[in-house]
């Protein structure tokens, strides 16, 4: 008789989750020489230990500390690119501009990107049927707590000029409830970070709006300036041209505004 299982509102653990995490770890450590010392089996054990046999609505940042310790990584603190609701373009950018890093370009971010996972209280099973939804079920679930933890650490490590890519097609270009708005903004260290520079990405049709004057960007600037961090903003009117110009900066069409 199958044991009763809690039904959550969110999708279950990504299929082949353990194999995926292990394979990603191996691939990452092969590509990044500075992380070759990492033992991927230990990383998986620490990852698993953060949520297995624990109630998936009662996960804490402390649960992830062994994993954080194993995944400790130094990225150039002045080359950090944060993003909100525009992950694909941010990743395309750092694939071209190799000296800049999103969270998903770090080992821990790379391991978990686009994956879902959760366990069950008092059993060693992974729940492949459903996992808690942040809104409908609980915020202290394994996935949300993981991203909150790594995002906080990533923001805390930043220095000098920090860039953030924002989606100008959304009704809230800056959303206080996003990971960027609720975690990263508040964990930038004013004694290390001089400026936060927002890149607002225009979508769809060409338009001449100045999205740096969007009310939510003004709100972001207000929050940032109260933390004694300077703020600047650029419109990226044509993201396709923007990427092209990152690839080929000497192109004659790249001198004009993008």
């Amino acid at each position: 008789v199958p044991r009763w299982r809690q039904q959550w509102s969110g999708p279950g653990t990504t299929k082949r989750f353990p194999e995926t995490v292990l394979a990603r770890c191996v691939k990452y450590t092969e590509i990044h020489p500075e992380m070759r010392h990492v033992d991927c089996q230990s990383v998986w054990d620490a990852f698993k230990g953060a949520f297995i046999s624990k109630h998936p609505c009662n996960i804490t940042e402390e649960d992830y500390q062994p994993l954080m310790k194993l995944g400790t990584q130094t990225v150039p603190c002045n080359k950090i690119l944060l993003w909100s609701r525009i992950k694909d373009l941010a990743h395309q950018f750092t694939q071209v501009q190799r000296d800049m890093f999103t969270l998903e370009d770090t080992l821990l971010g790379y391991l978990a990107d686009d994956l879902t996972w959760c366990g069950e209280f008092n059993t060693s099973k992974i729940n492949y049927q459903s996992c808690p939804d942040w809104r409908k079920d609980c915020s202290n679930n394994p996935v949300s707590v993981f991203w909150k933890t790594v995002s906080r650490r990533f923001a805390e490590a930043a220095c000098d000029v920090v860039h953030v890519m924002l989606n100008g097609s959304r009704s809230k270009i800056f959303d206080k409830n996003s990971t960027f708005g609720s975690v990263e903004v508040h964990n930038l260290q004013p004694e290390k970070v001089q400026t936060l520079e927002a890149w607002v990405i225009h979508g769809g049709r060409e338009d001449s709006r100045d999205l740096c004057q969007d009310p939510t960007i003004k709100e972001l600037e207000s929050i940032i300036s109260k933390r004694n961090i300077q703020f600047s903003c650029k419109n990226i009117y044509r993201p396709d041209k923007f990427l092209q110009c990152v690839k080929n900066p000497e192109d004659s069409s790249c001198t004009s505004e993008i």
């Epitope: 009310p215 940032i224 903003c233």
Partner: antibody, heavy 120, light 110 residues
Framework: EVQLLESGGGLVQPGGSLRLSCAAS????????MNWVRQAPGKGLEWVST????????YYADSVKGRFTISRDNSKNTLYLQMNSLRAEDTAVYYC?????????????WGQGTTVTVSS | QSVLTQPPSASGTPGQRVTISCSGS????????VYWYQQVPGTAPKLLIY???QRPSGVPDRFSGSKSGTSASLAISGLQSDDEADYYC???????????FGGGTKLTVL
């Protein structure tokens, strides 16, 4: 009561300089973008400059670019306009105005203006 | 000459409805919100309409704004003598990278 009070206007010779101030009260100055708008005698309104909350974003009209500098001191709740290389065509009433809350380009509170006369 | 074109004058009798137009281009009116200001001679301008058609609190519903393509309009119904003033449209111009005003329309209540 929300108030903006401009000062610093006066008579100045062409090529001279002047610094306008705008003292804000009745609202949290450090939460708002601020603007300078001018009006030549018998003419319409002309936008001059805009500054963001922290001063990290600044815009100027082409007619004043390179000659005027907008700045703010949030600790003193004051907006400034440094005007250099003044010309006769800069003669106008200069208004400071705050941006409308939760808006793009609207200016919902205006001062009464200070008069700048450029003449030899 | 202003980037936004307004008729220099308009007039109407008390109780009448008058409309003031504001014509621009894709880089200003079409792509951006339009604002309307009222300026009684000798006083500072007052925000009348924001974000194309929104009224700040305290502005009577006799005033309404609309926008279509590269043109915007301010309509005043039930005209009153104290509506006699200069009216300005304003927006952002992406080509000029700045805020712009129309030349203004002097409204006379006959």
């Amino acid at each position: 009561e929300v108030q903006l009070l401009e000062s610093g206007g006066g008579l100045v010779q062409p090529g001279g300089s002047l610094r306008l101030s705008c003292a804000a009260s009745g609202f949290t100055f450090s939460d708002y973008w601020m603007n300078w708008v001018r009006q030549a005698p018998g003419k319409g309104l002309e936008w001059v400059s805009t500054i963001s909350i922290s001063g990290g974003i600044i815009y100027y009209a082409d007619s004043v670019k390179g000659r005027f500098t907008i700045s703010r001191d949030n600790s003193k709740n004051t907006l400034y306009l440094q005007m250099n290389s003044l010309r006769a065509e800069d003669t106008a009433v200069y208004y400071c105005a705050k941006d409308n809350w939760n808006d793009y380009y609207g200016m919902d509170v205006w001062g009464q203006g200070t008069t700048v006369t450029v003449s030899s | 000459q202003s980037v936004l074109t307004q008729p220099p004058s308009a007039s109407g009798t008390p109780g009448q409805r008058v409309t003031i137009s504001c014509s621009g281009s894709t880089s200003n009116i079409r792509d951006n919100y339009v604002y309307w200001y009222q300026q009684v001679p000798g006083t500072a301008p007052k925000l009348l309409i924001y974000k194309d058609d929104q009224r700040p609190s305290g502005v009577p519903d006799r005033f309404s704004g609309s926008k279509s393509g590269t043109s915007a309009s301010l309509a005043i119904s039930g005209l009153q003598s104290d509506d006699e003033a200069d009216y300005y449209c304003a927006t952002w111009d992406g080509s000029l990278n700045g805020r712009v005003f129309g030349g203004g329309t002097k409204l006379t209540v006959l």
